[in-house]
């Protein structure tokens, strides 16, 4: 047990105010009542506490709320949020978007990606799903934060909010996240015309299956190389040279620049060299003419 601390009578704290900045660490420990601190959390951010003093205040709150802080406290954490670890945040139950906004503002300019990701996760859990209001808050206050959510959390996104997602919001999304978001986007944009549909679906295509890419190749979409490079390797490999040519349109020349990078490199290795030669780009590494391609995976599946 920690050595018992007694507050000197002249140092007793009856309210959280600026006088506390003159308290030594031990005095803060002994004299600040955690419940009083919790009740007056809204005052803390206006007081220029040192980092060491903020540590004491955090320990006070941890001691009072071992199962995680209530939202009334979380909402007013201010710069004390910078002291929180993902483990601390994982204990929270947050439902208010005002709380989320306040803490996202505080975290700006600080290396807190893990904490922010955990906070967003707790908000989604607290609200039951990633609803439109939450998504709007994320896009406004934390572009790219959508991608900090796990695929499991993203699965709760209703297709109706996909339209509010901007391309830059998906920049940091990984393949597993796009796998979840793509079908929702496809559903959300299904009634749009060809060119309009492609503009909307483009940022989500990292989750598209081969069949959908084949279908797009029939629509003269002229996919840019940056989008093509973000496609799933498994989805690109089965595409024929003709399908890729149609898919990229005038951008097909970019394949030469990317021929050493996945998924282009892997796709080249799967194509017949004479088919690649029809592109006139000098792409090398295809299957030499006269070679027979045995797809052993199909044979294994049949046996």
């Amino acid at each position: 047990d920690v050595e018992r601390t007694t507050c000197p009578p002249e140092k007793e704290v009856h309210e959280i105010d600026e006088s506390l900045i003159f308290y030594k660490k031990r005095e803060l420990e002994a004299c600040v009542d955690a419940a009083l601190l919790a009740a007056q959390m809204d005052r803390v951010d206006a007081i220029p506490f040192t980092y060491e003093q903020l540590d004491v205040l955090k320990h006070k709150l941890d001691e009072l709320y071992p199962q995680g802080y209530p939202e009334s406290v979380i909402r007013h954490l201010g710069h004390l949020f910078l002291k929180m670890s993902p483990e601390d945040i994982r204990k929270w139950n947050v439902t208010s978007l005002e709380t989320l906004k306040a803490l996202l503002k505080v975290s700006k300019g600080h290396e807190m990606s893990a904490q922010v990701a955990t906070l967003i996760d707790r908000v989604v859990v607290g609200r039951g799903q990633l609803d439109k209001d939450t998504a709007d808050t994320l896009t406004a206050f934390c572009p790219g934060c959508l991608c900090s959510l796990s695929p499991e959390r993203l699965s709760s996104v209703p297709p109706s909010i996909i339209g509010a997602v901007r391309p830059q919001d998906l920049d940091t999304c990984g393949p597993r996240q796009l796998d979840v978001l793509y079908p929702k986007a496809r559903l959300a944009f299904q009634n749009m015309s060809g060119s309009e549909y492609f503009v909307k679906i483009r940022p989500f295509l990292g989750g598209a299956p081969t069949e959908d890419l084949k279908a797009l190749s029939q629509q003269n979409v002229s996919m840019d190389l940056a989008t093509f490079m973000k496609l799933r390797r498994e989805a690109v490999l089965p595409l024929s040279v003709a399908e890729v040519q149609k898919l990229l349109g005038p951008h097909v020349e970019g394949l030469k620049v990317e021929e050493q990078h996945s998924p282009v490199r892997d796709w080249i290795l799967k194509q017949r060299q004479d088919d690649l030669d029809t592109l006139g780009l000098g792409l090398q590494g295809g299957i030499p003419n006269g070679y027979l391609i045995l797809d052993l995976s199909v044979r294994e599946a049949l046996s």
């Epitope: 047990d1 920690v2 601390t5 420990e29 002994a30 009072l64």
Partner: antibody, heavy 119, light 108 residues
Framework: EVQLLESGGGLVQPGGSLRLSCAAS????????MSWVRQAPGKGLEWVSA????????NYADSVKGRFTISRDNNKNTLYLQMNSLRAEDTAVYYC????????????WGQGTLVTVSS | EIVLTQSPGTLSLSPGERATLSCRAS???????LAWYQQKPGQAPRLLIY???SRATGIPDRFSGSGSGTDFTLTISRLEPEDFAVYYC?????????FGQGTKVEIK
């Protein structure tokens, strides 16, 4: 099931000392703020003292400050109240109570132990 | 310290009637830190209401709390025989915790 069991009460002369104990079970004592509350015969409730779980930070009512000391042994899940310089007006049933920070209230109470200060 | 004054001191009512108990604070109390307790003779107090209006576990819905600032109320919508007891309000921020002097609800 949360249980708080006070002991150590009895008859003591004015100026004397007594140590009350409260054995806690059924919850994580090491995470919990604890309090002592007393009730003089036929009177209302009076909060006496409180202690935090880890730092053992203490607070007292003015009426007992300097005479009573609250402490805890987290290894034994036990809360104590050391009462010195006892006065007739300290005669009361002393209750040990658990403070629930999430409710900001004393949500579990012991059955109390009677302290009588008399010559 | 915050002084809590309860009124009336005694309330004489019959089973089935509505009881309204008042608790007034000498200065503003955050509703999050206002609680009500019930105590029967020879027993320890029991938490009824916390946060001014939330019922504690196992407390029947005939008990309700309301109020903010300096005025708080405990209401028992229909008195049952087991409700005749003494009721205390309490504030828990800041220290010292203080209790009201109690309201006795007795059978008329």
């Amino acid at each position: 099931e949360v249980q708080l069991l006070e002991s150590g009460g009895g008859l003591v002369q004015p100026g004397g000392s007594l140590r009350l104990s409260c054995a806690a079970s059924g919850f994580t004592f090491t995470h919990t703020y604890m309090s002592w509350v007393r009730q003089a015969p036929g009177k209302g409730l009076e909060w006496v003292s409180a202690i935090s779980p880890t730092y053992s930070t203490t607070n007292y009512a003015d009426s007992v400050k300097g005479r009573f000391t609250i402490s805890r042994d987290n290894n034994k899940n036990t809360l104590y109240l050391q009462m010195n310089s006892l006065r007739a007006e300290d005669t009361a049933v002393y209750y040990c109570a658990r403070y629930n920070a999430y409710h900001a209230a004393l949500d579990y109470w012991g059955q109390g132990t009677l302290v009588t200060v008399s010559s | 310290e915050i002084v809590l004054t309860q009124s009336p001191g005694t309330l004489s009512l019959s089973p089935g009637e509505r009881a309204t108990l008042s608790c007034r604070a000498s200065q503003s109390v955050s509703s999050s830190y206002l609680a009500w307790y019930q105590q029967k003779p020879g027993q320890a107090p029991r938490l009824l209401i916390y946060g001014a209006s939330s019922r504690a576990t196992g407390i029947p819905d005939r008990f309700s709390g309301s109020g903010s600032g300096t005025d708080f109320t405990l209401t028992i919508s229909r008195l049952e025989p087991e409700d005749f007891a003494v009721y205390y309000c309490q504030q828990t921020v800041p220290y010292p915790y203080t209790f009201g002097q109690g309201t006795k609800v007795e059978i008329k």
